[in-house]
Interface confidence: medium
């Protein structure tokens, strides 16, 4: 099956916008928007720090770490209020992602 221009293959995602701003207190705030064509039972999420189609149950129950959102070698830690997760690099640097 041929894809029309701008059409995504089933189960794939692409980054639409990536804004970086406001480097305050050595923190860079990045906002990313993605477009996904997910299969039934899937929903847009993050895997290995990239937009991906993930099991919808993960999103419903806010078990964010089950998406494997961090890079290989990083540790995933759920924020207690379930608003997102942190990825801890081997050197100890922590990157926090919140879902909106």
């Amino acid at each position: 099956q041929f894809l029309k221009e701008g059409q995504l293959a089933a189960g794939t995602c692409e980054i639409v916008t990536l804004d970086r701003c406001c480097n305050k207190n050595r923190r860079t705030i990045a906002r990313q928007t993605a477009r996904c064509a997910c299969r039934k039972g899937q929903i847009a999420g993050t895997t290995r720090a990239r937009p991906a189609c993930v099991d919808a149950r993960i999103i419903k129950t806010k078990q964010w770490c089950d998406m494997l959102p961090c890079l290989e070698g990083e540790g995933c830690d759920l924020l207690i209020n379930r608003s997102g997760w942190t990825c801890t690099q081997p050197g100890g640097r922590i990157k926090t992602t919140t879902v909106s």
């Epitope: 540790g75 830690d77 924020l79 801890t88």
Partner: antibody, heavy 122, light 110 residues
């Protein structure tokens, strides 16, 4: 085997502070969120609070919010509960609890400590 | 808050069902905790709806139907006599997600 060993309980005075420590062994401590649950004499279980794996995030039950601080030392495999401005209703047994997955909730505790008894009385 | 019966009783070998309903976070499931005496530590018999720790006998199982969760003990034994607490999470704008437990169900083996 997973073991959680609490210490620091005993007789405390109202208005004072207590510090409880839970020493963990038998699992990779830094890979699990941890929490504290307490039980007043003759009563049910009450959520005290939790801490995430890195120690950067905590949450507390309404009865202790503003008075409790939970911290952890992944190098020493310990989690600490500090409770200030003690009241008689803080009397009870305090249990250390381990989450079963990448998070801890009252539905995902898979291991408990033996508990340490705290009595708040003048 | 979570609602569970205050007591249930059964003869050895019978099947016992203890229900738990309520809570604000059914997606995260329910846990069941056994306490044999007021001075002893709880023991997890079921966590995350239906997961059973490796040292818990297979006669203990958990199931969920809607917002009600059921702990089933198939072929109850004398040593199962205890208080059983269910656990879940509730959400409040003040405290966020906070763990909640039922008041406990006393199981008597006749």
């Amino acid at each position: 085997a997973v073991t959680l060993d609490e210490s620091g309980g005993g007789l405390q005075t109202p208005g004072g502070a207590l510090s409880l420590v839970c020493k963990a062994s038998g699992f990779t401590f830094s890979s699990y969120q941890m929490g504290w649950v307490r039980q007043a004499p003759g009563k049910g279980l009450e959520w005290v609070g939790v801490i995430n794996k890195s120690g950067s995030d905590t949450s507390y039950g309404s009865a202790v919010k503003g008075r409790a601080t939970i911290s952890r030392d992944n190098g020493q495999s310990t989690v600490r509960l500090q409770l200030n401005n003690l009241r008689a209703e803080d009397t009870g047994t305090y249990f250390c609890a381990k989450g079963s997955a990448s998070y801890i909730t009252a539905a995902t505790i898979d291991a408990w400590g033996h508990g340490t008894e705290v009595i708040v009385s003048s | 808050a979570l609602t569970q019966p205050s007591s249930v009783s059964a003869n050895p070998g019978e099947t016992v069902k203890i229900t738990c309903s309520g809570g604000g976070s059914s997606g995260y499931g329910y846990g069941w905790y056994q306490q044999k005496s007021p001075s002893s530590a709880p023991l997890t018999v079921i966590y995350w709806n239906d997961k059973r720790p490796s040292d818990i006998p297979s006669r203990f199982s958990g199931s969920k139907s809607g917002s009600t969760h059921t702990l089933t003990i198939t072929g109850v034994q004398a040593e199962d006599e205890a208080v059983y607490f269910c656990g879940n999470d509730d959400y409040s704008s003040d405290s966020g997600y906070v763990g909640v437990f039922g008041a406990g169900t006393t199981l008597t083996v006749l």
